[in-house]
């Protein structure tokens, strides 16, 4: 039995300045090109090396772009989305959804083909242990005073 794959979803506003070779990324998606099942959203499929997005460092492949310069990307044809980016001007504001994969469920099992998500217990257990050690050390220190 495979562990359930969950995602931590965060949103971020990313302001890019168009470089000599443009914004420097590719997109997939749209109402006529659903790349993610049951989702016609626009996703980053590639970030060009040394392009504006790569040099900024925040935009990642797999990110969902929610808006460009305040304009919603919902229910757009793919080419309309492409044109929106191409005509967005010199300073471009992107509202982006990042998805960080975390995995819950049985230890040591991973869905076939799933990228290796970090099981959440592997993060929480060391953090808890460190907290306990720090609390114990603090109490010992106070007793000595």
């Amino acid at each position: 039995m495979n562990g359930r794959v969950d995602y931590l979803v965060t949103e971020e506003e990313i302001n890019l300045t168009r470089g000599p070779s443009g914004l420097g990324f590719n997109i997939v998606g749209g109402t006529d090109q659903q790349y993610v099942s049951n989702d016609s959203g626009i996703y980053v499929s590639r970030i060009k090396e040394n392009g504006a997005a790569a040099l900024d460092g925040r935009l990642q492949e797999g990110d969902k772009i929610l808006s460009v310069n305040g304009q919603d990307l919902k229910n757009l044809l793919h080419q309309d989305a492409v044109d929106l980016f191409r005509n967005a001007g010199y300073a471009v504001s992107l509202r982006v959804q990042h998805r960080l994969q975390v995995q819950n469920g049985p230890i040591g099992h991973r869905g076939e083909g799933d990228p290796s998500g970090i099981p959440i217990f592997m993060v929480l257990v060391p953090v808890f242990a460190l907290t306990m050690v720090a609390a114990w050390a603090f109490m010992r220190y106070r007793q000595q005073l």
Epitope: I27, V28, Q33, R46, H78
Partner: nanobody, 127 residues
């Protein structure tokens, strides 16, 4: 990932025509931007033509405009390059290239750095 195999190259006389094909295997072919590049001996790989995921948008190098036509058949996972009025200067190894998604940058010219997947090439010789 996508694998690309070119065919259709050969020896042709100046003024003649050839049609190159590029068969792609892999998932979601209709999300890939496809291109053709060429490389003559001792020279860099040069952009020839590009076609969008749906075939609705194309771009060409100035040297081939009006003579070459790029097209694609998403049902057959194949992209084509129809080459007419061939010149000796068109002699080169022709490469099919693919990249996932559509560039958000408008450009009449693409560099090889804009593509991630390449075929092995097919030789075109114009005498």
């Amino acid at each position: 990932d996508v694998q690309l195999v070119e065919s259709g190259g050969g020896l042709v006389q100046a003024g003649g025509s050839l049609r190159l094909s590029c068969a792609a295997s892999g998932r979601a072919f209709n999300t890939y931007t496809m291109g053709w590049f060429r490389q003559a001996p001792g020279l860099e790989r040069d952009f020839v033509a590009e076609i969008s995921w749906s075939g609705g948008s194309t771009g060409y190098a100035d040297s081939v405009k009006g003579r070459f036509t790029i097209s694609r058949d998403n049902a057959k996972n194949t992209v084509y390059l129809q080459m007419n009025s061939l010149k000796p200067q068109d002699t080169a190894v022709y490469y099919c290239a693919a990249v996932i998604g559509s560039p958000t940058d408008y450009s009449d010219y693409r560099s090889s750095l804009d593509y991630d997947y390449w075929g092995q090439g097919t030789q075109v010789t114009v005498s």
